[in-house]
Structures are given as structure tokens and as C-alpha cells.
């Protein structure tokens, strides 16, 4: 029996839980959380999870809302693992250049760039 | 007259310069640079630009190869600016949840997730 839910399934389930518990989560009218002003989400993972921490500390726990925050903590763990893999493999310059080219190509086509 | 080239044009020009100077850049046979092992590039911007710094310090400067590294430094400046914008605006919880939902939605559909 797999002890871990695959990350892709975890994300789907978390989206559903987020929707389910939205009313409970927005109950605190005065709470203010930093929200990134652009859509390049991966650049902002640190701030997003800080915001989740703030929200968790202000939310009455119990039932499936706990499952929501547990899931978000597992997603953070996955992203932290991905960040660790950013510098794991030392490669020849040609391979670094191919990665750089791909990065710039994606930036060129997929990033939301405001001049 | 605009003093700055728009970031999107800068990225395109940099891709072209990268291609032009590839042979010069790969001349160092023994240099090894960390290469991320996944395609979620935005998580790895720090390591990518560290690699660029390593490469620049090992590359004979002059001519348009200098322009390449100048461009890359401007792209880094743009990304650093984007990172600053991750925590600039404090918003109500419902707005944070909208952003979080969008983040998870993008993760669900666009990220390359390996279990």
C-alpha cells in the first residue's frame, strides 16, 4: 500500500478542499496577507507558503480543514525538494547552456512579462 | 527615446547571442556547472544565475559576448524585481485564496510533476 499520495493527486485534492473550506477561511475580516502582484507563481513560493502559515495560525482547526493544511505542507515539502534539485548535478558547459536556452525560451513564450 | 529595451525583446536578443557565442562559451573543457534536474525553471533562478556568473568569470570578454552577459545581468535584475513583488501588496484573505487557487491550478496543469 503506497504511504504517499502522488503529488499531482495531492494538488487536485487540495484544490477541492480549498473550495470546500473557503467560507471558513475568509471568516477573519481583518486579516491581511501579502499577495504577489504577478502571475509568475514559482518565483513566489516562499511568500505563498508564509501566507499559508499566517492563515493556518488564524484558522480554527478540526475536521478536513486540518487535511487542507496538511496537504499544503506536503506540497511545500515537494517544492522544497524540487529547489534542492536545482544545484545537484554538475555538468559540462554545453549542458548548462542547453538548460539556460530552454529557460530563456520558456521565459520568452510562457512568462507574463510586464515591461 | 526609451533608454531601456523591453524585457521581452531583451530575452529574444539574449537567445540569439547565446547561439552566436556557444562555441566560445563551451571552450573550457573541464568546467562543471550545476544544472537543475527538472523543468520548473522559475524555482531555480538563483542557481541558474550563479552558473552564469561562473561561466562569465571563465570566459574571455570582449565584443558581443560582453553584451550577452550584460543582457543576462539585466534579465536577473528583472527577475529580482519580480521576486520583490511577491510580498509587496497586503490583501484580504479572499484575494490570497484566489491567488493560491490559481497557483495550485497552474501547478496542477503546467508543472512537470514527478512522483
Amino acid at each position: 500500500i503506497p504511504t504517499e499520495i502522488p503529488t499531482s493527486a495531492l494538488v487536485k485534492e487540495t484544490l477541492a478542499l480549498l473550495s470546500t473550506h473557503r467560507t471558513l477561511l475568509i471568516a477573519n475580516e481583518t486579516l491581511r496577507i501579502p499577495v504577489p502582484v504577478h502571475k509568475n507563481h514559482q518565483l513566489c513560493t516562499e511568500e505563498i507558503f508564509q501566507g499559508i502559515g499566517t492563515l493556518e495560525s488564524q484558522t480554527v482547526q478540526g475536521g478536513t480543514v486540518e487535511r487542507l493544511f496538511k496537504n499544503l505542507s506536503l506540497i511545500k515539502k515537494y517544492i522544497d525538494g524540487q529547489k534542492k534539485k536545482c544545484g545537484e548535478e554538475r555538468r559540462r558547459v554545453n549542458q548548462f547552456l542547453d538548460y539556460l536556452q530552454e529557460f530563456l525560451g520558456v521565459m520568452n513564450t510562457e512568462w507574463i512579462i510586464e515591461s | 527615446i526609451p533608454t531601456e529595451i523591453p524585457t521581452s525583446a531583451l530575452v529574444k536578443e539574449t537567445l540569439a547571442l547565446l547561439s552566436t557565442h556557444r562555441t566560445l562559451l563551451i571552450a573550457n573543457e573541464t568546467l562543471r556547472i550545476p544544472v537543475p534536474v527538472h523543468k520548473n525553471h522559475q524555482l531555480c533562478t538563483e542557481e541558474i544565475f550563479q552558473g552564469i556568473g561562473t561561466l562569465e568569470s571563465q570566459t574571455v570578454q570582449g565584443g558581443t559576448v560582453e553584451r550577452l552577459f550584460k543582457n543576462l545581468s539585466l534579465i536577473k535584475k528583472y527577475i529580482d524585481g519580480q521576486k520583490k513583488k511577491c510580498g509587496e501588496e497586503r490583501r484580504r484573505v479572499n484575494q490570497f485564496l484566489d491567488y493560491l487557487q490559481e497557483f495550485l491550478g497552474v501547478m496542477n496543469t503546467e508543472w512537470i510533476i514527478e512522483s
Epitope: 545537484e88 548535478e89 554538475r90 555538468r91 559540462r92 554545453n94 549542458q95 542547453d98 538548460y99 536556452q101 530552454e102 525560451g105 | 556557444r22 562555441t23 563551451i26 571552450a27 573550457n28 573543457e29 573541464t30 562543471r32 544544472v35 537543475p36 534536474v37 527538472h38 523543468k39 512537470i112 514527478e114
Partner: antibody, heavy 117, light 109 residues
């Protein structure tokens, strides 16, 4: 542990196109630290590099085979493929797929392809 | 394009030292990789970056590289070392991989 497995016909007729696929397991073909390569070995001879591909689709080919070779990658299936056109008896060889970091780390077991009518 | 030259064969008695060379123009400025291949099997890396051994490869295998010649040295040769040995470099002017022609190591006796 990354494992690679070649598949494709063992017999190809002269002038036709040789097509092989390599399936990668135990690791992602989208791993930025690897190129995915094809190498061949004629009977009783040394290793001959055919070409390699990056997950982004960038390809590099042996100049002596470049006009006949196409390597492609399918990240959704975790596979990469080799096509060698206009084959002759001189293309009879054991064909290996391999992962290429700074060196060839992991190899398939190889598949013998014979070109004969 | 870059060319690597290896002797077709080297013979050595068990317990002796075998030296297999790989010649190339200014090869000393390149990183050299050595592979061992036994009949019917895929090659296995025995030395990388001129002289580094991957885990699991005996200390008897060592490498050196300077000038126009790289050398794979196998000390205290054993019968099980009988195999083909190929050197490999990258041709950085073209991003291409280059193999030597291979050397058959025969262990006498």
C-alpha cells in the same frame, strides 16, 4: 536506478528507414542533467556515437551520419527515438541507447539490427 | 573533426600491469573517459575525468592524461579484466562525442 530498454525491428531492408525507440524507467527523461543518446557498434568493431537529444528537443548528430539521422523525444511517454534513413548493409550493428551526463552513465542492453533483403 | 587513436590490442600476463593509450591532438586539455566492454554486454565506465574512478571500480584501474596521450593503467591484471577498452572525449568545438577505436586487452596464460 535509471534503466533503458531499446525496442524495434531486428531486420530492416536496404534503402528503408531503421526505427528504434528507447524507453526510460526509474527516472525522468525531463531531467535537465542528462542528454539521451544513441550509439552503435558494428560487429567486431568499436563504438560509434550517433547523436543525442536534450529534453527541450536540442539535437546533436555525428557529422558522418547527420544527413540520415533524426532523434526525437517524447517526454509524456518517457521515450526517445532514432530514425536512420536509406540504410545499407553497412548499418548492420548493435544499437545502444544511453543516458549522457558528463559521460555515458546508463546503457540499454543493446539491440542487433541487421540490414538485409 | 577530432580523432582518437588506440592500439587495436594489448596483451599482458596475469599480475602484471597493462597500459592502454589513447592519442589525440592536445588531449591533455580535455576530460577523458574510459569504458570496459565484455562480449555481449553494454560498456561500463571505469574511469572518468582523466583519473577518477566510479564507485565499485577496483583501485587497480587508474588513468592519466597530458600532452597528446591519455593512458588507462590496470595494475595486477586479472583474467576477469580481459575485455575491450574504449576512450571517449567531447569535441567542444562542435558539442560532439568522440570514441577511440577500442583496444582488446588479452590476459595471457
Amino acid at each position: 536506478q535509471v534503466q533503458l530498454q531499446e525496442s524495434g525491428p531486428g531486420l530492416v531492408k536496404p534503402s528503408q528507414t531503421l526505427s528504434l525507440t528507447c524507453t526510460v524507467s526509474g527516472g525522468s527523461i525531463s531531467n535537465g542533467g542528462y542528454y539521451w543518446s544513441w550509439i552503435r557498434q558494428h560487429p567486431g568493431k568499436g563504438l560509434e556515437w550517433i547523436g543525442y537529444i536534450y529534453y527541450s528537443g536540442s539535437t546533436y548528430y555525428n557529422p558522418s551520419l547527420k544527413s540520415r539521422v533524426t532523434i526525437s523525444v517524447d517526454t509524456s511517454k518517457n521515450q526517445f527515438s532514432l530514425k536512420l534513413s536509406s540504410v545499407t548493409a553497412a548499418d548492420t550493428a548493435v544499437y545502444y541507447c544511453a543516458s549522457l551526463g558528463n559521460w555515458f552513465d546508463y546503457w540499454g542492453q543493446g539491440t542487433l539490427v541487421t540490414v538485409s533483403s | 573533426s577530432y580523432v582518437l587513436t588506440q592500439p587495436p590490442s594489448v596483451s599482458v600476463a596475469p599480475g602484471q600491469t597493462a597500459r592502454i593509450t589513447c592519442g589525440g591532438n592536445n588531449i591533455g586539455s580535455k576530460a577523458v573517459y574510459w569504458y570496459q566492454q565484455k562480449p555481449g554486454q553494454a560498456p561500463v565506465l571505469v574511469v572518468h575525468d582523466d583519473s577518477d574512478r566510479p564507485s565499485g571500480i577496483p583501485e587497480r584501474f587508474s588513468g592519466s592524461n597530458s600532452g597528446n596521450t591519455a593512458t588507462l593503467t590496470i595494475s595486477r591484471v586479472e583474467v576477469g579484466d580481459e575485455a575491450d577498452y574504449s576512450c571517449q572525449v567531447w569535441d567542444s568545438s562542435s558539442d560532439h562525442v568522440v570514441f577511440g577505436g577500442g583496444t582488446k586487452l588479452t590476459v595471457l596464460g
